[in-house]
């Protein structure tokens, strides 16, 4: 069976995941025999999950991160907060605004010359054999003088979309985030009714490509809310 593959970018023209609601965490929400919808995947449990507004950074916008609104506040209550600008304090990369990353507790520009060379060998194996990463730990080893701008290919682990090659975005895949293809015209997309409503998806789809938007497929206007098919369509 397709099992939990349903919400993968690669699957075209299949019903989207159900709304943003998945019943009780860990329960199977299925609309067709043998198919388990993301969010109701039988392998998943969601611990400490706050349905709204967020549980993890990727549920927030590109200029936001997910955290407790008060310092030292209840870890169970998290909302999407505005990203931190350069030179502001941080604890992880997602806290920093696009174009920056967290190094030694401070948001610094990722386009500085030393960015690719100085950061420790981890994230994605996606950067080829020279494979630098986005972790804020210095390698303290000398690298050759060539620039490290290789981006993650499809299937590579990533932290944000800027880690991925052109035509790919960084999206949730079970408990990790990997580079997936940006959606093309006619491909099924996920239209979130409200911010944070995609927290239950175990797969995230990428956004629609340039010149496309995620809209209800014309012949699905009459369908019920939960089964309306959204696809990437020309503006």
């Amino acid at each position: 069976t397709l099992n939990s593959v349903l919400n993968s970018n690669a699957i075209k023209n299949l019903p989207p995941p159900l709304g943003g609601a998945a019943g009780h965490p860990g329960s199977a929400v299925s609309a067709a025999p043998g198919i388990l919808y993301p969010g109701g995947n039988k392998y998943q449990t969601i611990d400490n999950y706050q349905p709204y507004p967020c549980a993890e950074d990727e549920e927030c916008g590109t200029d936001e991160y997910c955290a407790s609104p008060t310092r030292g506040g209840d870890a169970g209550v998290q909302i999407c907060l505005a990203c931190r600008k350069r030179r502001k304090r941080c604890m992880r990369h997602a806290m920093c605004c696009p174009g920056n990353y967290c190094k030694n507790g401070i948001c610094v520009s990722s386009d500085q010359n030393h960015f690719r060379g100085e950061i420790e060998e981890t994230i994605t194996e996606s950067f080829g054999n020279d494979h630098s990463t986005l972790d804020g730990y210095s390698r303290r080893t000398t690298l050759s003088s060539k620039m490290y701008h290789t981006k993650g290919q499809e299937g590579s682990v990533c932290l944000r979309s800027s880690d991925c090659a052109s035509g790919l975005c960084c999206a949730r895949h079970f408990w990790s985030k990997i580079c997936k293809p940006v959606l093309k015209e006619g491909q099924v997309c996920t239209k979130h009714r409200r911010k944070g409503s995609h927290g239950l998806e175990i797969f995230q789809r990428c956004y629609c490509g340039e010149g496309l938007s995620c809209r209800i497929q014309k012949d699905h206007h009459q369908a019920s809310n939960s089964s309306r098919l959204h696809t990437c369509q020309r503006h």
Epitope: N48, E56, S126, Y137, G155, I178
Partner: antibody
């Protein structure tokens, strides 16, 4: 460099419990999902469980669901696997590894379930 | 569940020879979400290839991965003495994550 060190394995009777730990260093722990994989003696690899970077999302293989609990303490850079109601077939070397394709592995800790 | 079948079970070759290992999925993976690992006796596995064809950090260029859909291949262009080990493929397209049963590359 990235290091993962498991501990907590040992001999336990059927029905007993064990808690495995995996101490991580050399990378920003809370940026990464983590995975437990096991290998029975002389056998192949079997995925056991996975957990997202914040710990909000956890996943289990059918063979351990309801008996094992994966968790993490990001302030301690440590991953855990609480194993309850252990069975003989849970006997294996348990590895912690980073991400969904396992780019770094610990050395493993042996869990033996036997009476 | 996606079953990964590796062939052959054992490959007997000499140093310098080319090794071709196959991994066949019971379902189309749609995306290149396949990894290859090397494991030597008494050691943890080591990632070689991810995303079907991307070499991991520090992995020599003689290792290459290819394939899509249901058929994937790991090629070792010229075997070195240290390459004799067991090789596993793993899919991360869907849950449960599954591994192949392994191919043992032994010295002829």
């Amino acid at each position: 460099q990235v290091q993962l060190v498991e501990s907590g394995g040992g001999l336990v009777q059927p029905g007993g419990s064990l808690r495995l730990s995996c101490a991580a260093s050399g990378f920003t722990f809370n940026n990464y999902g983590m995975t437990w994989v096991r290998q029975a003696p002389g056998k192949g690899l079997e995925w056991v469980s996975g957990i997202s970077g914040s710990g909000s999302y956890t996943y289990y293989a059918d063979s351990v669901k309801g008996r094992f609990t994966i968790s993490r303490d990001n302030s301690k850079n440590t991953l855990y696997l609480q194993m309850n109601s252990l069975r003989a077939e849970d006997t294996a070397v348990y590895y912690c590894a980073r991400t969904i394709y396992m780019d770094y592995w610990g050395q493993g800790t042996l869990v033996t379930v036997s009476s | 569940d996606i079953v990964l079948t590796q062939s052959p079970a054992t490959l007997s070759l000499s140093p310098g020879e080319r090794a071709t290992l196959s991994c066949r999925a019971s379902q189309n993976l749609f995306s290149p979400y396949l990894a290859w690992y090397q494991q030597k006796p008494g050691q943890a596995p080591r990632l070689l290839i991810y995303g079907a064809s991307n070499r991991a950090t520090g992995v020599p260029a003689r290792f290459s991965g290819s394939g899509s859909g249901t058929d994937f291949t790991l090629t070792i262009s010229s075997l070195e003495p240290e390459d004799f080990a067991v090789y596993y493929c793993q899919q991360y397209m869907t849950l449960p994550l599954t591994f192949g049963q392994g191919t043992k590359v032994e010295i002829k």
